[in-house]
């Protein structure tokens, strides 16, 4: 029924997924050494890793096992929703001599999330 | 002092690290299809990912950024303690014809944990 569908949709929305997160370097005190950009879209991962773990939750065998163990023993934590794919961004920063340096920073932007 | 040392050790012990977890396949209902072994040492990851993230917490640049953002905006979650290195185990299982098959299962055992 439509009611069941909306409940499912709401429940599904609570599952592990990528969320928007714009990081302004001035908010975290990095604007004194990062010249450009002034911030970037980092994203973050958040949400439930429920039993049983569905395929789209991009999990490992260990996460499947741990989720199963948690279902019979809650003292063992569920798997956690974390970045499973990350990409790089380029930034201009000031080195110790106040020189502007262009550097590629690895693993800065979340491209995908999963239960691990 | 010894008291301070034990407090530090206890606090340090709360940080993200690997914990023992023996999975007995009969406890999770897998003994009907897994022939051997009867269980295995899977380990699991658990603990805090505090600000600032120390080197030994094996984090990504994104985790460092997210931890920093969490320190100024608690609505963004901290990084999560998860397996960062996993290894395989071999298991004997029964296939659909009740034949015993030896298979290598990837990503079954936690070798290392980190904040992600």
């Amino acid at each position: 029924s439509p009611k069941h569908h909306s409940q499912r949709a709401r429940k599904k929305n609570k599952n592990c997924r990528r969320h928007s997160l714009y990081v302004d370097f001035s908010d975290v005190g990095w604007n004194d050494w990062i010249v450009a950009p002034p911030g970037y879209q980092a994203f973050y991962c958040h949400g439930d890793c429920p039993f049983p773990l569905a395929d789209h939750l991009n999990s490992t065998n260990h996460a499947i096992v741990q989720t199963l163990v948690n279902s019979v023993n809650s003292s063992i934590p569920k798997a956690c929703c974390v970045p499973t794919e990350l990409s790089a961004i380029s930034m201009l920063y000031l080195d110790e001599y106040d020189k502007v340096v262009l550097k590629n920073y690895q693993e800065m932007v979340v491209e995908g999330c999963g239960c691990r | 002092s010894p008291k301070h040392h034990s407090q530090r050790a206890r606090k340090k012990n709360k940080n993200c690290r690997r914990h023992s977890l023996y999975v007995d396949f009969s406890d999770v209902g897998w003994n009907d299809w897994i022939v051997a072994p009867p269980g295995y040492q899977a380990f699991y990851c658990h603990g805090d990912c505090p600000f600032p993230l120390a080197d030994h917490l094996n984090s990504t640049n994104h985790a460092i950024v997210q931890t920093l953002v969490n320190s100024v905006n608690s609505s963004i979650p901290k990084a999560c303690c998860v397996p960062t290195e996993l290894s395989a185990i071999s298991m004997l299982y029964l296939d659909e014809y009740d034949k015993v098959v030896l298979k290598n299962y990837q990503e079954m055992v936690v070798e290392g944990c980190g904040c992600r």
């Epitope: 302004d24 370097f25 001035s26 908010d27 604007n31 010249v35 450009a36 950009p37 002034p38 911030g39 380029s90 930034m91 201009l92 000031l94 001599y97 106040d98 020189k99 502007v100 340096v101 262009l102 | -």
Partner: antibody, heavy 121, light 108 residues
Framework: QVQLQESGPGLVKPSETLSLTCTVS????????WSWIRQPPGKGLEWIGY???????RYNPPLKSRVTISVDTSKNQFSLKLSSVTAADTAVYYC???????????????WGQGTLVTVSS | EIVLTQSPGTLSLSPGERATLSCRAS???????LAWYQQKPGQAPRLLIY???SRATGIPDRFSGSGSGTDFTLTISRLEPEDFAVYYC?????????FGGGTKVEIK
């Protein structure tokens, strides 16, 4: 296209605070760094500082103790305050845009037409 | 800070001639982060060149920039009457951002 217009008093007394505003039209103030540059009569150019729409600033060290640059995104404006002025602060004051991307950061384009501020009693 | 020295202070040339303006930095300008501007009397500076050699939008191809490290050059291949002005270099490879003292190109 984007246009910048400086406004503010043309005469300021010594020891007082110089206040100027730059109004940006034709573009959102939220996508770039916004800068102030000055030019004493018959002399060269001096960068004062810049601001991002979030309020993040960077100032020229010799002026840092006297300079405040602020932004009002609702009005698409940014402002300069220079305290404890002397005759040496007499100059044409320009506002200008700096690209905030790594691929185009650092040069000034476009500029406002400039406003002359004289410090005199 | 990086000090930029422009030479000559004044360049007296006739229309149609070639103008060569020099900008020397007190230390190496990283990644050729150098720009050139033209300023006419009573007007704001106008961006000509960025990245040492890239022409800004709408700038005629008689203007060209070259150089790296500490030595940079702005060349105007054939001077037009509207090119007589003051030219400034600016570095953005180090903080603070700094300008040269300018070169005046005047009619001979």
């Amino acid at each position: 296209q984007v246009q910048l217009q400086e406004s503010g008093p043309g005469l300021v007394k010594p020891s007082e605070t110089l206040s100027l505003t730059c109004t940006v039209s034709g573009d959102s103030i939220s996508s770039y760094y916004w800068s102030w540059i000055r030019q004493p009569p018959g002399k060269g150019l001096e960068w004062i500082g810049y601001i991002y729409y979030s309020g993040s600033t960077r100032y020229n060290p010799p002026l840092k103790s006297r300079v405040t640059i602020s932004v009002d995104t609702s009005k698409n404006q940014f402002s300069l305050k220079l305290s404890s002025v002397t005759a040496a602060d007499t100059a044409v004051y320009y506002c200008a845009r700096i690209c905030s991307s790594t691929s185009c950061w650092g040069w000034f384009d476009p500029w406002g037409q400039g406003t002359l501020v004289t410090v005199s009693s | 800070e990086i000090v930029l020295t422009q030479s000559p202070g004044t360049l007296s040339l006739s229309p149609g001639e070639r103008a060569t303006l020099s900008c020397r930095a007190s230390q190496s300008v990283s990644s050729s982060y150098l720009a050139w501007y033209q300023q006419k009397p009573g007007q704001a500076p106008r961006l000509l060149i960025y990245g040492a050699s890239s022409r800004a939008t709408g700038i005629p191809d008689r203007f060209s920039g070259s150089g790296s490290g500490t030595d940079f050059t702005l060349t105007i291949s054939r001077l037009e009457p509207e090119d007589f002005a003051v030219y400034y270099c600016q570095q953005y490879g180090s903080s603070p951002l700094t300008f040269g003292g300018g070169t005046k190109v005047e009619i001979k």
